[in-house]
Interface confidence: low
């Protein structure tokens, strides 16, 4: 399939001009190669009319030009002084006319409508509003005002000042008579239909001295705006329908066969299953405008999209609409990355996120798509050191491996982490990508203790068991903080019995903290990686407490002796607190993609009970 894209149909009227934009993948070769516009002949050839190398056919001399915009990957053909002879089939393309790197364009030039003298022409888009102005003289100021539509040979009354409204216009027409100073009345028709098009006559008075004014109303289907996006990338449809529909339900639909337009998303909560996890309808402004973002573009997403406003949340006659023709370029600059990543409860995932490598300094973000209402994507983490409070200790965004890819690691997984996540930056919005995290049956490969309490001034060693399949990987321990996970020295300890099915080849790597201080308290991760590519991780919280005074009872015994409802401020408390921190849905604050960072994001943990086995699948 050719990656060149342009308008399938261009329509104009004799004497007017057209501007035709053709899109191409902006590779180095494409940017510099010849661009052309040619007319297709009956026998299959294509005669060049204008090219980027300076050629202009005699038919186009003085009325056409071709301009290349290499930085955008577009070129534009402007043709003026159109005649009906210009109607025909054309190609815009790159290279040699016959090579197939082209797009077919149909140009249709119509005769202007034959109109009566003194006819005011109103050209209005489908679904919009028209105001027909009707002047009159003083002697007709007190007389009946009316608007007629010419149906066949006869005028049919549409509305008059005595209160009559033609049934075809009920609820969408009014007649306004201006103040006494102005000799003018107006007829306002809303929610214009294609059938409203035609010739109208407004009249003040009914006798031979009446004032008459002819009007020609043309109702046009909006020409689609061309949108050219890369496979796996993102597209944003900005829909501005006007303040008069600010409080009406909005929709985006995709045209299928004939007049059908299948709802993709609407403000009444409907969303097509094919767009689950990869679409957002951004809240509308006071003026009724809104936007829809679709990520993870697929070949089958190409087509014609309409946005509109109607109380039903779908396309109906009289809906004001905007149209787009989306082309999905399969010669994508966006690299393939997994669209589904699987993890087990208590385990972890490492997600690779592509970004435009020209924008290495951009801020990277990761957000969780939520389908409720119109869809939203509250931020969870960014590359500037912000992490949503309830994800502390289990989520990190790393700039590695760099050069067009960053990594997001999420551990302590629960079933509630299943869902769709978006990778994005504050730079090129086309590089938003979607990944689905699925939680599957299984055990985490890395095993760490559920809770660890260190004592001030003492040494702490925390084991991390890993199976033989990771023997060739680099193992590490790191201390988690908002900006990442700082690597620490670790020590290979030899065989371990944690994985009985692994023939003594299961190994452990331990974290050692000498002379523990208060600063050592926090989350630590054990992980495996290959070069700059991260694998699994397991997290453990290290609490730090005072050294016990001589003769005091050991805390671990206190826990065993405690009555069921007695409060024990030891590792058991920390365990419950960890559970709350691990649960990503126990907090109400949200951070939307467009929000500024809220530094006052501290929140209280909700306490709920549960064993450490439920939380992390850790071995003791």
């Amino acid at each position: 399939k050719s990656p060149i894209f342009g308008p399938e149909e261009v329509n104009s009227v004799e004497g007017n001009s057209v501007s035709i934009t053709c899109y191409y993948p902006p590779t180095s070769v494409n940017r510099h190669t010849r661009k052309y516009w040619c007319r297709q002949g009956a026998r299959g050839g294509c005669i060049t009319l204008i090219s980027s190398e300076g050629y202009v056919s005699s038919k186009y001399a003085g009325r056409a030009n071709l301009t290349n915009f290499p930085e955008n990957g577009t070129f534009v053909v402007n043709i003026a002084q159109l005649s009906q002879d210009d109607s025909g089939r054309y190609k815009c393309g790159l290279g040699i006319n016959s090579r197939g790197l082209s797009f077919d364009v149909s140009l249709e030039v119509s005769q202007g409508p034959g109109l009566l003298n003194d006819t005011k022409v109103y050209t209005v888009d489908l679904g919009r509003t028209v105001t027909i102005n009707c002047p009159f003289k003083t002697e007709n100021a007190q007389k009946r005002k009316s608007l007629y539509k010419q149906i066949g040979l006869y005028p049919v009354l549409v509305i008059d000042s005595s209160g009559y409204v033609n049934p075809n216009y009920t609820g969408r027409i009014r007649l306004d008579i201006q103040g006494t100073g102005q000799l003018l009345f107006s007829v306002v028709i809303n929610q214009l239909r294609l059938s409203d098009a035609g010739q109208y006559l407004c009249q003040a008075g009914d006798d031979s001295n009446s004032n008459k004014k002819n009007a020609d109303l043309q109702v046009l289907k909006p020409e689609p705006e061309l949108v050219y996006e890369d496979l796996r990338g993102s597209v944003t449809f900005h829909c501005a329908l006007g303040p008069e529909v600010a409080n009406v339900a909005k929709f985006l639909c995709r045209q299928s066969s004939g007049e059908n337009c299948d709802v993709v998303v609407n403000t009444l909560g409907k969303r097509a299953p094919a767009f689950e996890g990869r679409i957002l309808l951004n809240p509308q402004d006071k003026d009724g405008s809104f936007s829809v973002v679709i990520t993870g573009l697929r070949k089958e997403d190409a087509g014609r999209y309409l946005c509109g406003a109607h109380s039903d949340g779908q396309l109906q006659e009289g809906s004001p609409i905007q149209a787009w023709q989306l082309f999905v370029n399969e010669e994508s600059t966006i690299p393939r990355s997994p669209t589904v990543v699987k993890g087990v409860a208590g385990g972890s995932v490492a997600v690779l996120c592509p970004y435009n490598r020209k924008e290495s300094k951009s801020i990277k973000y990761w957000c969780l798509w939520e389908g409720a209402q119109n869809g939203r994507c509250p931020l969870l983490v960014d590359s500037e050191g912000w992490v949503k409070a309830q994800y502390e200790g289990r989520l990190s965004l790393l700039e590695e491996p760099g050069n067009g890819t960053f990594t997001v690691i999420l551990n302590q997984l629960t079933s509630r982490d299943a869902g769709f996540y978006w990778c994005l930056t504050n730079g090129d919005t086309l590089w938003r990508t979607t990944v689905e995290i699925k939680i599957i049956e299984g055990e985490p490969n890395l095993k760490v203790p559920g809770n660890v309490t260190a004592v001030l001034g003492e040494t702490l060693k925390v084991p991390c068991h890993f199976p033989c399949k990771f023997s060739s990987y680099e193992k590490y321990w790191c201390k988690w903080n908002n900006t990442g996970c700082q690597a620490l020295p670790s020590q290979d300890e030899g065989p371990s019995k944690a994985f009985v099915n692994c023939d003594e080849n299961s190994r452990l790597v331990s974290l050692t903290l000498n002379l523990v201080t208060r600063a050592d308290e926090g989350w630590y991760w054990c992980g495996v990686k290959q070069g700059h590519f991260y694998g699994e991780t397991a997290a453990v919280y290290v609490a730090v407490e005072e050294r016990k005074a001589a003769g005091s009872r050991d805390v671990s015994l206190a826990k065993a002796d405690a009555a069921p409802d007695e409060k024990v401020l030891d590792s058991g408390f920390r365990e419950i607190e960890n559970k709350a921190i691990q649960d990503p849905r126990l907090f109400a604050e949200e951070k939307a993609v467009a929000d500024t960072r809220d530094q006052a994001d501290g929140s209280r943990a909700s306490v709920d009970s549960g064993s450490s086995e439920e939380q992390g699948g850790s071995s003791r």
Epitope: E8, E9, N11, S87, R89, S106, E108, V109, S110, Q111, P113, G114, L115, K149, Q150, I151, G152, L153, R193, L194, S195, A197, G198, Q199, Q218, V219, L220, K221, G258, E259, E317
Partner: nanobody, 125 residues
Framework: EVQLVESGGGLVQAGDSLRLSCAAS??????????MAWFRQAPGKEREFVAS????????DYADSVKGRFTVTRDNAKNTVTLRMNSLKPDDTAVYYC????????????????WGQGTQVTVSS
């Protein structure tokens, strides 16, 4: 361009019925964006409007002389428009032309951008 080809004309008796068809071909990538119409031209007379239909068949319009006798329909899946003519009269004798337009306008001033070649209908008394 759009090519319009009419068919179904012929010689019939007064009171009979006839069905004219118009097939659109060529650059008909989105036939449903064209309004369509039928016109006719009797010998020695000007071409006159007969009937029109909008993009999806939601709106139709007829000349007074054919109202109640003629019906225009379209099938966007097949790129065709049809004129069903009942209770034919000798006055209906003419060459019938199919026409397309970029926008729909009811009434006799249909904004034609393409014409067919025409098909002859003769109604004998």
């Amino acid at each position: 361009e759009v090519q319009l080809v009419e068919s179904g004309g012929g010689l019939v008796q007064a009171g009979d019925s006839l069905r004219l068809s118009c097939a659109a071909s060529g650059r008909t990538l989105s036939f449903d964006t064209y309004a369509m119409a039928w016109f006719r031209q009797a010998p020695g007379k000007e071409r006159e409007f007969v009937a029109s239909i909008d993009y999806n068949g939601g709106s139709t319009d007829y000349a007074d002389s054919v109202k109640g006798r003629f019906t225009v329909t379209r099938d966007n899946a097949k790129n065709t428009v049809t004129l069903r003519m009942n209770s034919l009269k000798p006055d209906d004798t003419a060459v019938y032309y199919c026409a397309s337009a970029r926008y729909y306008r009811s009434g006799t001033s249909f904004p034609v951008n393409y014409w067919g070649q025409g098909t002859q209908v003769t109604v004998s008394s």
